[in-house]
């Protein structure tokens, strides 16, 4: 991490991200200072940009549920700082407002 504050996503990406390349996600919430609700998916490759997605979309909900129930070997993230190399496109600086990281749960919630 480069210690920078997390930016707000201003619009949803038109592309989608394959489930198996996603490491975790975090929620962007308007109540915490960002203009739109969003889910930001963090790719396994830390050099790749986060993908900003609409939480109402079915594919987004599926991927979130998958990540929620999958045990993770990752250590919990420190705060909510962006990974080095994250894209700034379509984002607005908002300090650390609106940033809530959800790493994969350690307890599977599956069947």
């Amino acid at each position: 991490s480069d210690g920078g504050a997390q930016d707000c996503c201003l619009k949803y990406s038109q592309r989608k991200i394959p489930a198996k390349v996603v490491r975790s996600y975090r929620k962007q919430e308007p109540s915490l200072g960002c203009s739109i609700p969003a889910i930001l998916f963090l790719p396994r490759k830390r050099s790749q940009a986060e993908l900003c997605a609409d939480p109402k979309e079915l594919w987004v909900q599926q991927l979130m549920q998958h990540l929620d129930k999958t045990p993770s070997p990752q250590k919990p993230a420190q705060g909510c700082r962006k990974d080095r190399g994250a894209s700034k496109t379509g984002k607005k600086g908002k300090g650390s407002k609106g940033c809530k990281r959800t790493e994969r749960s350690q307890t599977p919630k599956g069947p």
């Epitope: 989608k16 991200i17 394959p18 489930a19 198996k20 109402k56 979309e57 079915l58 594919w59 909900q61 599926q62 991927l63 549920q65 998958h66 129930k69 999958t70 599956g110 069947p111």
Partner: antibody, heavy 117, light 107 residues
């Protein structure tokens, strides 16, 4: 106990319409996506349609696109499938299934739809 | 549209290992699940996320998924395992597909 109970099946003529319902109980309905899956007599499973938790996002199999509409009423814990312009090949047992991530973890017992003149 | 291909039937001797394959273009890049269906009954989930077992499903059931093939393996096959088995996966557009199904016979 987690349960899904389909209803609304029956005999309908080609070109006709039918609305299936699926009553959910035993779980927080609006925390799950839901799907319809069908099975023609003696044939395999065919996914029909899916809907997101609050009903905003929907997807359909090519075979039913433009004819079938999936919807849900979270206040009634009920999933629906409106089927229009029915064809003989739509004859099947229709199952309601609860989605979690990338799989179906709870299934109903199904309701039979027969399209015949 | 995307298709998943399964053998129509697989036979296994009692107590031996059965393997049911599911072929699809780069299915290994997606998550596969498997369902067991006995005559007159609704399907039951036996494997999800390629290789995870739901509670209540015996350890004899396992799964793998790589490249263009997902595989359901049933070790120490029992008479009660006789059923139709279906693989399934979702694409990135939240469209699902099932394989054609495989009838497992335990000899």
């Amino acid at each position: 106990e987690v349960q899904l109970l389909e209803s609304g099946g029956g005999l309908v003529q080609p070109g006709g319409s039918l609305r299936l319902s699926c009553a959910a109980s035993g779980f927080t309905f609006n925390s799950y996506s839901m799907s319809w899956v069908r099975q023609a007599p003696g044939k395999g499973l065919e996914w029909v349609s899916a809907i997101s938790m609050e009903g905003y996002s929907k997807s359909y199999a090519d075979s039913v696109k433009g004819r079938f509409t999936i919807s849900r009423d979270n206040s009634k814990n009920t999933l629906y499938l409106q089927m229009n312009s029915l064809r003989a090949e739509d004859t099947a047992v229709y199952y309601c299934a609860r989605g979690y991530g990338y799989y179906f973890d709870v299934w109903g017992q199904g309701t039979l739809v027969t399209v015949s003149s | 549209s995307y298709e998943l291909t399964q053998p129509l039937s697989v036979s296994v001797a009692l107590g031996q290992t059965a393997r049911i394959t599911c072929g699809g273009d780069s299915i290994g890049s997606q998550y596969a699940s498997w369902y067991q269906q006995k005559p007159g009954q609704a399907p039951v989930l036996v494997i999800y996320d390629d290789n995870e077992r739901p509670s209540g499903i015996p350890e004899r059931f396992s799964g793998s998924n790589s490249g263009n093939t997902a595989t359901l393996t049933i070790s120490r096959a029992q008479a009660g395992d006789e059923a139709d088995y279906y693989c399934s996966s979702w694409d990135m557009d939240a469209v699902n597909v099932f394989g054609g199904g495989t009838k497992l016979t335990v000899l």
